[in-house]
Every structure is written in C-alpha cells, then in structure tokens.
Interface confidence: medium
C-alpha cells in the first residue's frame, strides 16, 4: 500500500536524482509523525530509497506506479 503506518521509519535525507523508473516496483509514504515528509521507493532488489515528495520527478513516478 502507498499509505504509511506508524511503524514506518522516517527519512532524514533524500536521493538527489532519479533512479531508472523501470527498476522501482512500489512506493509508500512515511508517517505523518516524521519531521520530514518523504516518499520511499522500493527497488526490484527490495532496497528502500527516500525521495522528496515535492520534486516533480517523484510525483511523476508516483503517478506512473499508481497507473501500473
């Protein structure tokens, strides 16, 4: 689910540039209790990468994942 739970860890930094979209399989938001809002992308290798939800490329990836 793209929605966060209270057990979700927080992000304290963001990736600075896009990873190839084809290698990202899902995403979720970190908890609203975190000091920094963040989207966590999950790669096909199940690695989690924090991203800034204000960035255009992040929003585009979310839209793409929602449609797939």
């Amino acid at each position: 689910s793209p929605y966060s739970s209270d057990t979700t860890p927080c992000c304290f930094a963001y990736i600075a540039r896009p990873l190839p979209r084809a290698h990202i399989k899902e995403y979720f938001y970190t908890s609203g209790k975190c000091s920094n809002p963040a989207v966590v992308f999950v790669t096909r290798k199940n690695r989690q990468v924090c991203a800034n939800p204000e960035k255009k490329w992040v929003r585009e990836y979310i839209n793409s994942l929602e449609m797939s």
């Epitope: 992000c11 600075a16 540039r17 190839p20 966590v40 990468v49």
Partner: antibody, heavy 129, light 111 residues
C-alpha cells in the same frame, strides 16, 4: 577515505577501442553509483554514463549510446569503461567518480554529500594515427 | 556547447569577493535539481566544493558559498586567496538528457 585508483595512460589508433579501469578501495557498494566523466584538453567536463549497482543497471549519455560500455566486477572491486570506434576528438582525460544514491529510511550518520564526491586522478587517452 | 552556462573567466584581488554564475533551464536547475560546484586546481582532478546548492563537504572553508534561484545558481568566494586560482564547474541533473550535465567552467584568476 575511499580512493578510486585508475589505470595508466593509453595511446590508441582511430577506429580502435580503449578500456580503462578504476579500482574502488572500499569495494563496490549498492550505496553508490559510479560514473565516468571525461575532459578534453582545455575543455569542460562531460558526463558519459554510470553503473548503478543499487538497481543493477547502467545508464549512458545519449551521445555515447552504442559505443560505450560501462561494467563493474564486484569480485575485483573494479569499474571499467570501454569506448569503441575511437576518433581524434575522443582524446581526453577520463575520470571515474562516485555518487551516493542509496538514501534509505533511518539514521543518516554514514551519509556523504550528494553529487560526484570522490574522483579518480584520471586516465589520459590519446587517439592519434 | 554546455547545457549550463558559466562565464569563461572571473578575476579578483586577494581579499575580495567574487561570484560565478551558472544558468540552466527548466529541465535541470529550474526543475528543482540540486546544483553542485566543483573546483579543479591546475593539473588535478575535480573536487566537490559545494553540494545540494549550498552545503560544504567537510574540509571546505566557509569562504565558499552557493545559492540558487529559478533556473540559475551562483558560487560566491569571499576573502579571495591565491590558492583559490582554479577552474570552477557547476553541475546538476537534467531530466531531458537523463544524466549529469555541467557548465563550461569558469577560470578564476587571483590578481
């Protein structure tokens, strides 16, 4: 401090190919992408491409598509750049550089700076007939 | 022709303040991608000087500062010293080219 140690200078004929290596002292890690950047004599920096172990893929600048191959050998902790169909305007210093890409949830005490934060000393490739 | 535009050269006397501009477009700086600055001393590899628009890696003096606005970025160097004489490059990610792009470089001369 991680070091990127590059192979020695090369002199090549037009039409041939060159393979340059870059040994990563701390090993190849999912946390970093590894790029190749070149600089022709008296000119600026030009990004060529990168390998991204985190997602097991390689990306290339459009102008090098088809004649550039970037590979990494985890067992040797070494990055390679092979450029084919060499022309005289490929004469340049070729640098390997690393870039942090894995920024996971949780503490960031080990996080380094964004951008290309560690560079090799460069390998001069001269293409001449 | 570089994707990011920098002045070819700037100069200043010791102790002075100089700025180097870097102009991009809507597919890179204007798209919110962070700008990084690199210093290249004569005969050496580039070194990361400023990352994430305005942050200094450890060991970089606070005489160096960076900022961005719109589709442009700038590097400021105050209290100019002779050892600052070098080439300076801005770099960022470009969405259209899908890769790192750099400015053409600015040669700083300390008079």
């Amino acid at each position: 401090q991680v070091q990127l140690v590059q192979s020695g200078a090369e002199v090549k004929k037009p039409g041939s190919s060159v393979k340059v290596s870059c040994k990563i002292s701390g090993g190849i890690s999912d946390n970093y992408a590894l790029s190749w950047v070149r600089q022709a004599p008296g000119q600026g920096l030009e990004w060529m491409g990168a390998v991204i172990p985190l997602v097991e893929t390689t990306s290339y600048a459009q102008r090098f598509q088809g004649r550039l191959t970037i590979t990494a050998d985890d067992s040797l902790n070494t990055l390679y750049m092979e450029l084919g169909s060499l022309r005289s305007d490929d004469t340049a210093m070729y640098y390997c550089a690393r870039e942090q890409v894995a920024v996971g949830p949780g503490p960031t005490s080990n996080r380094g700076p964004d951008g290309l934060d560690v560079w090799g000393r460069g390998t001069m490739v001269t293409v001449s007939s | 022709q570089s994707v990011l535009t920098q002045p070819p050269s700037v100069s200043g006397a010791p102790g002075q303040r100089v700025t180097i501009s870097c102009t991009g477009s809507s597919s890179n700086i204007g798209d919110g991608y962070d700008v990084h600055w690199y210093q290249q001393l004569p005969g050496t590899a580039p070194k990361l000087l400023i990352y994430g628009n305005s942050n200094r890696p450890s060991g970089v003096p606070d005489r160096f500062s960076g900022s961005t606005s719109g589709t442009s970025a700038s590097l400021a160097i105050r209290g100019l010293q002779s050892e600052d004489e070098a080439d300076y490059y801005c770099g960022t990610w470009d969405d259209i080219l899908n890769g790192w792009v750099f400015g053409g470089g600015t040669k700083l001369t300390v008079l």
